[in-house]
């Protein structure tokens, strides 16, 4: 969590002389409470925007905004504390609105807003905005809270974000799955536009059973500059059992940017439609299917890696 | 001293009901997401259900959704859990515990443990 | 949702030995993974989080690392104290799932 560059930020509007200052989280008139105390914020909202810093990196930030209750207690405002909290970590950061002068009511409604709490991708947060000074220790709450979750990297505005892209979002592998003959599944993928490794995971299941029954990895040499935005071939040979045949496949780029963390694709091929006259599955079958994998034997394709290759190479 | 401290643990039939209570100490409570796991008699750890600071966030693992509900006062430092239409696989050591700033979760209670059987 | 495996489910070694846990997460969690050590009959204790970062208080013989979808605890010499049940837990986002746990004993 972090605050959108170090400009100046600003809260002032006409008829009101405000400061934005960092914030422990922990307002003084928690320590030392106020008899007379605000109402709490009305309408609290939390949206989605962009905003670019100083380098010209796009980030997704919180757009956060609120109204005032029209009572006579914002005359006792002095300020208000933004806090967002990153539900995974707990992390937490704040800002205080510090007023320098007094509000005073005029025909419209006070309204409020800050655009300046950078969030990550996928990341769920709780945003508090609590009207300063905070309430005695058994007054009404002054604070309004909301949750916020922050769409991932595949949502379409998302994915032209500087943390995004890093991860490899623009990248479009098109992954394309065909079933041979022999036991054999094609994937083919487009290559990206950088000479990069790739691994291509496969993972089959029976279609009753959550359990996987058998996966390999397939690794991909980093393409030379002729082969980028080519399309790569990886052919698998699949599980003897025909019931070992629900299939998903992962493609994993090691893009720079991202290394082990970048964005990976998936596809999922399920199991063909059996007809009634089609043959039990034996018991003797299932034998192998549930033998403990020593840590060591996930990847049972090390002797197999000679059928992965670039398209242009057939 | 950081200290949790559950309660409300108890032998109860199928179909029943416990609420658990959570007690902190030592801690600003108000400022921490909180969290609630359980242990199966000689099984591993089941994340149950976490509830943010100001209760505006809030998530239940699939096992006990629509029959759990996890419930917090900052006024009286307390979380709690209750535990509704229970069946006997909730039978469980039902911790509490508050999550480390930067991950993963650092202080937690010792248990109280929950038996359904008929 | 995201599936956490850990391998081995058992491991039984000499005392100052190298003991490595793998956990693997069925997607990318990044780097928001945690271990934790549990003694028997007693309470969970966090030993590493954000993947590689030491608990304070912690012995420096515990380390983490890993990233992705692949992560790894490792022991630079086991010690008769470090008898124990270990988890990995994966905190991403919501359902913050654990691992099935490596149970770890001296030979």
């Known amino acids: 969590l972090r605050l959108l560059d170090h400009r100046a930020l600003v809260c002032s509007q006409p008829g009101l002389n405000c400061t934005v200052k960092n914030s422990t989280c922990l307002d003084d008139s928690w320590i030392h409470p106020r008899n007379l105390t605000p109402s709490s914020p009305k309408d609290l909202q939390i949206q989605l925007h962009f905003a670019h810093t100083q380098q010209g990196d796009l980030f997704p930030v919180a757009h956060i905004e609120w109204t005032l209750q029209t009572d006579a207690s914002i005359l006792y405002l002095e300020g208000a504390e933004l806090s967002v909290l990153q539900l995974n970590t707990n992390e937490r950061l704040c800002v205080k609105f510090q007023f320098l002068s007094m509000l005073q009511h005029h025909r419209k409604r006070w309204r409020f807003s800050f655009s300046h709490f950078v969030v990550d991708p996928g990341q769920e947060y709780e945003v508090t905005v609590h009207h300063l000074p905070k309430p005695i220790p058994d007054g009404d709450p002054n604070h309004q809270s909301k949750n916020f979750l922050v769409p991932d990297c595949e949502h379409a505005r998302m994915k032209v974000t500087t943390p995004c892209m890093s991860s490899g979002s623009l990248w479009d592998p098109n992954i394309t799955v065909e079933t041979l003959e022999a036991h054999q599944l094609r994937v083919s993928f487009t290559l990206w536009n950088e000479s990069t490794p790739y691994q291509v995971l496969l993972e089959s299941f029976s279609d009753s059973e959550n359990h996987s029954c058998f996966d390999v990895v397939k690794q991909i040499f980093a393409p030379r500059q002729e082969e980028f935005h080519q399309r790569a071939n990886v052919t698998f040979t699949l599980s003897k059992f025909h019931w070992c045949c629900h299939h998903h496949v992962q493609v994993q780029p090691f893009f720079s940017s991202c290394l082990n963390d970048c964005l990976r694709h998936a596809v999922t091929v399920p199991c063909p439609v059996i007809s009634n006259t089609t043959v039990p599955k034996p018991v003797a079958d299932y034998i192998p299917l549930w033998e403990p994998r020593s840590g060591s034997s996930d990847y049972k394709d090390d002797d197999d890696k000679g059928s992965s290759h670039h398209h242009h190479h057939h | 001293e950081v200290q949790l401290v559950e309660s409300g643990g108890g032998s109860v039939q199928p179909g029943g009901s416990l609420r658990l209570s959570c007690a902190a100490s030592?801690?600003?409570?108000?400022?921490?997401?909180m969290n609630w796991v359980r242990q199966a008699p000689g099984k591993g750890l089941e994340w149950v259900s976490i509830?943010?600071?100001?209760?505006?966030?809030?998530h239940y693992a699939d096992s006990v959704k629509g029959r759990f509900t996890i419930s917090r006062d900052n006024a009286k430092n307390s979380l709690y859990l209750q535990m509704n239409s229970l069946r006997d696989e909730d039978t469980a050591v039902y911790y509490c515990?508050?999550?480390?700033?930067?991950?993963?979760?650092?202080?937690w209670g010792q248990g109280t443990t929950v038996t359904v059987s008929s | 949702d995201i599936q956490m495996t850990q391998s081995p489910s058992s491991l039984s070694a000499s005392v100052g030995d190298r003991v490595t846990i793998t956990c693997r997460a069925s997607?990318?969690?990044?780097?928001?993974l945690a271990w934790y050590q549990q003694k028997p009959g007693k309470f969970p204790e966090l030993l590493i989080y954000?993947?590689?970062t030491l608990q304070s208080g912690v012995p420096s013989r515990f380390s983490g690392s890993g990233s992705g979808t692949d992560f790894t605890l490792t022991i630079s010499s086991l010690q008769p104290e470090d008898v124990a049940t270990y988890y990995c837990?994966?905190?991403?986002?919501?359902?913050?799932?654990f691992g099935p746990g490596t149970k770890v004993d001296i030979k």
């Open positions: 997607q990318g969690i990044s780097n928001y």
């Open positions: 954000a993947a590689s």
């Open positions: 509830i943010s600071s100001r209760s505006s966030i809030i």
């Open positions: 837990q994966k905190y991403n986002r919501a359902p913050f799932t």
């Open positions: 030592g801690f600003t409570f108000s400022s921490y997401s």
């Open positions: 515990a508050r999550p480390k700033v930067g991950g993963g979760m650092d202080v």
